[in-house]
């Protein structure tokens, strides 16, 4: 059974992931972003189901495409270089989903823009955090 300290750690990691995803969304989905329209041409795959931490496997598999979009952005939009930002997210995702069980991600048929993709994972983080508090 999860201890209160492990639950707290999970919550903090989810909050960190949530803040990173929100920062990316705010930096991108903004008319002041000169590359916005081109960023919206990138296609992302969405999870068929995202209700548990193991489903973060689906986010992990889309981090490389996410980095490619961020490479288009101006560095002033974010505090970190895309590679470093994605690396940080990857570390959190790996810790949260765990590596004990191998989970095969199932994707929905519909693809999504980067804005829809980020909003989906932001909602996921918020949903899991609410169950922990």
């Amino acid at each position: 059974a999860p201890t209160s300290s492990s639950t707290k750690k999970t919550q903090l990691q989810l909050e960190h992931l949530l803040l990173d995803l929100q920062m990316i969304l705010n930096g991108i989905n903004n008319y002041k972003n000169p590359k916005l329209t081109r960023m919206l041409t990138f296609k992302f795959y969405m999870p068929k189901k995202a209700t548990e931490l193991k489903h973060l496997q689906c986010l992990e598999e889309e981090l490389k495409p996410l980095e490619e979009v961020l490479n288009l952005a101006q560095s002033k939009n974010f505090h970190l270089r895309p590679r470093d930002l994605i690396s940080n997210i990857n570390v959190i995702v790996l810790e949260l989903k765990g590596s004990e069980t191998t989970f095969m991600c199932e994707y929905a048929d519909e693809t999504a823009t980067i804005v829809e993709f980020l909003n989906r994972w932001i909602t996921f983080c918020q949903s899991i955090i609410s169950t922990l508090t």
Partner: antibody, heavy 119, light 108 residues
């Protein structure tokens, strides 16, 4: 309604200059990046240049780099294309087009203006 | 330089289905957009993000994408659908904006 109205086309000799204008109405012009797209007679569409909402970022196709300059006056809701050192291959219908902020394409187009470069 | 490849022309009878293809190496990770351009007019967006239809575009227009191929389908083509159709997207890095060469659809 949302509208882009173009002016300034015409016939010009090779090596000469021409300026096109695109007047926007029905939306907050200063919130949108804008583009110029051209179409040579009987040919396909070719993106030419783009300019950010505030004019700070400009990009050009290799075919016009160093010869064409795009600019905007947000107080007049107007986009411009200054074309210098014109060549015969610049002969085309020029369209101004708005960058969408919700999808990855051009969502509003001007009516087009013909530029003919001929001696 | 990145290219999107379309067939130059297609002819169908009214009521038939018209299928226009657009091939591009980046399509597994890039959305396709389709513009209709009638003679002497500016282009009009008829499909965005592979499959989505802007408001005001008839239901007979649909889009799909699989692998490196995007497809525009007009089910039950009408005489008023006669036009040039251009696919549009960006290259692999998203840096360059690219149009296909266009397909002239004749409905007669």
């Amino acid at each position: 309604q949302v509208q882009l109205v173009q002016s300034g086309g015409g016939v010009v000799q090779p090596g000469r200059s021409l300026r096109l204008s695109c007047a926007a109405s029905g939306f907050t012009f200063s919130n949108y990046a804008m583009n110029w797209v051209r179409q040579a007679p009987g040919k396909g569409l070719e993106w030419v240049t783009s300019i950010s909402y505030d004019g700070a970022n400009r990009e050009y196709a290799d075919s016009v780099k160093g010869r064409f300059t795009t600019s905007r006056d947000n107080s007049k809701n107007t986009l411009y294309l200054q074309m210098n050192s014109l060549r015969a291959e610049d002969t085309a219908v020029y369209y101004c087009a708005r960058d969408s902020t919700t999808l990855g394409a051009f969502d509003v187009w001007g009516q087009g203006t013909m530029v003919t470069v001929s001696s | 330089s990145y290219e999107l490849t379309q067939p130059p022309s297609l002819s169908v009878s009214p009521g038939q289905t018209a299928t226009i293809s657009c091939s591009g190496d980046a399509f597994p990770r890039k959305f396709a957009y389709w513009y209709q351009q009638k003679s002497g007019q500016a282009p009009v967006l008829v499909i965005y993000e592979d499959t989505r239809r802007p408001s005001g575009i008839p239901e007979r227009f649909s889009g799909s994408s699989s692998g490196t191929m995007a497809t525009l389908t007009i089910s039950g083509a009408q005489v008023e659908d006669e036009a040039d159709y251009f696919c549009y997207s960006t290259d692999t890095t998203g840096t360059h904006r690219v149009f296909g060469g266009g397909t002239k659809l004749t409905v007669l």
